[in-house]
């Protein structure tokens, strides 16, 4: 059985988290997408794109900016001026309903600490890029930063569909909760998802 494991990313206060969510499939291009934090029984939607999602149109909610690039199947998420209280588990999803969102990659366990950064090439206001590839493997990918650019072996590209668990989540039981999540194959998803074009007859091409 495939398991999803969270990946831990450590930042200092004031830094910027930049996540590239890779959704690959054209049918998801105009789907509404969301950046959510796992809090309690339901994920908390922090920001979501328009419905249908507009190409290259930034959506800003407080310190969070989402920008969807249909032509390359990438959603950029930025969280600026990170604070200690931002620590937690985050997911980038194809947003349908809080109880059943379609996760695009293994969740991110964000840990924000006080104090100046001791990592090379970073500062209080620096940005670290996290590259997210759809994953059906349990092995977590480490972060890829723009400088230095590292060579990684990414898992096969395919979209993972997850039904959000209905239990309390904290940073100590995250892995166990994720292991209980239900995975659906891409082919099942084909039958399950009502395509955006049928709902909206709206295209951006």
């Amino acid at each position: 059985t495939t398991e999803l494991t969270e990946e831990k990313y450590e930042y200092k206060e004031g830094q910027t988290l930049e996540v590239k969510c890779d959704y690959t499939l054209e049918k998801f291009a105009s789907s509404q997408k969301a950046w959510q934090k796992m809090e309690g029984k339901m994920p908390k939607i922090l920001a979501k794109t328009e419905r249908p999602s507009e190409n290259s149109h930034p959506v800003q909610v407080g310190r969070i900016t989402l920008e969807d690039y249909h032509d390359h199947g990438l959603l950029q998420v930025q969280m600026t001026n990170l604070q200690v209280e931002d620590s937690g588990l985050y997911q980038c999803v194809i947003y349908q309903h809080p109880k059943e969102s379609h996760v695009l990659f293994n969740p991110i366990c964000l840990v924000v600490t006080k104090g100046s950064s001791g990592t090379p090439g970073s500062s209080e206001n620096s940005t670290q890029n996290v590259y997210r590839t759809p994953s059906t493997t349990a092995k977590a990918l480490g972060p890829r930063y723009t400088s230095p650019r590292t060579v990684t072996q990414a898992p096969p590209e395919s979209t993972v569909v997850v039904s959000t668990p209905g239990s309390e989540i904290n940073l100590t039981n995250v892995t166990d909760i994720i292991r209980e999540q239900k995975l659906i194959s891409e082919e099942d998803l084909e039958q399950k998802l009502i395509s955006e074009e049928d709902l909206h007859h709206h295209h951006h091409h």
């Epitope: 390359h72 990438l74 295209h203």
Partner: antibody, heavy 121, light 111 residues
Framework: EVQLVESGGGLVQPGGSLKLSCAAS????????MHWVRQASGKGLEWVGR??????????YYAASVKGRFTISRDDSKNTAYLQMNSLKTEDTAVYYC????????????WGQGTLVTVSS | DIVLTQSPDSLAVSLGERATINCRAS??????????LHWYQQKPGQPPKLLIY???NLESGVPDRFSGSGSGTDFTLTISSLQAEDVAVYYC?????????FGQGTKLEIK
Amino acid sequence: EVQLVESGGGLVQPGGSLKLSCAASGFTFSTYAMHWVRQASGKGLEWVGRIRTKSSNYATYYAASVKGRFTISRDDSKNTAYLQMNSLKTEDTAVYYCTRDMGIRRQFAYWGQGTLVTVSS
Amino acid sequence: DIVLTQSPDSLAVSLGERATINCRASESVDTFDYSFLHWYQQKPGQPPKLLIYRASNLESGVPDRFSGSGSGTDFTLTISSLQAEDVAVYYCQQSNEDPYTFGQGTKLEIK
């Protein structure tokens, strides 16, 4: 298992037409863009063009060398992509491969075995 | 159109030695710091086989002696320890912009 099988190749005179087919199986055909790539004998690979999915209005894109002469289409109900080649030239002689990418602007993970098109008088 | 230029055109390397193939793009093939540059191997009479995707990601089932690196306009395919079965023609390909384009190919032989 993903399979792509090209057919329709053969000998045709310059100025003639030919329609190639690519029968796909082992995956949800309608989800992916399909591409054609060709290779003249002893030469390198040349991307011919691609057709996107229904959610992208079946948009097509072509290499400059074939634009206006070649047309890519698809029939999702038949899991088949097509390459209609008109006004053929001797330099179009090549093995034509059908390929499937891994998503939007992604790599070609699956290839057919190719079908040979010979344009000669 | 983005032109991909591979170097060298041909390469002879001893078994067990390192082989390096370069690919230079006429303009950046990056979007969002993702490099839409891929590497393929082709043996005579066969269709190409994907080795590396998006510059540095090893395709499933490909031996880990193959690796890719680079970003922007300059990319490298490395075979850390050449095996007899690696004799082939290698191509880079970009998918960042239409039309997609391939490099001219590099023929790798055993010295």
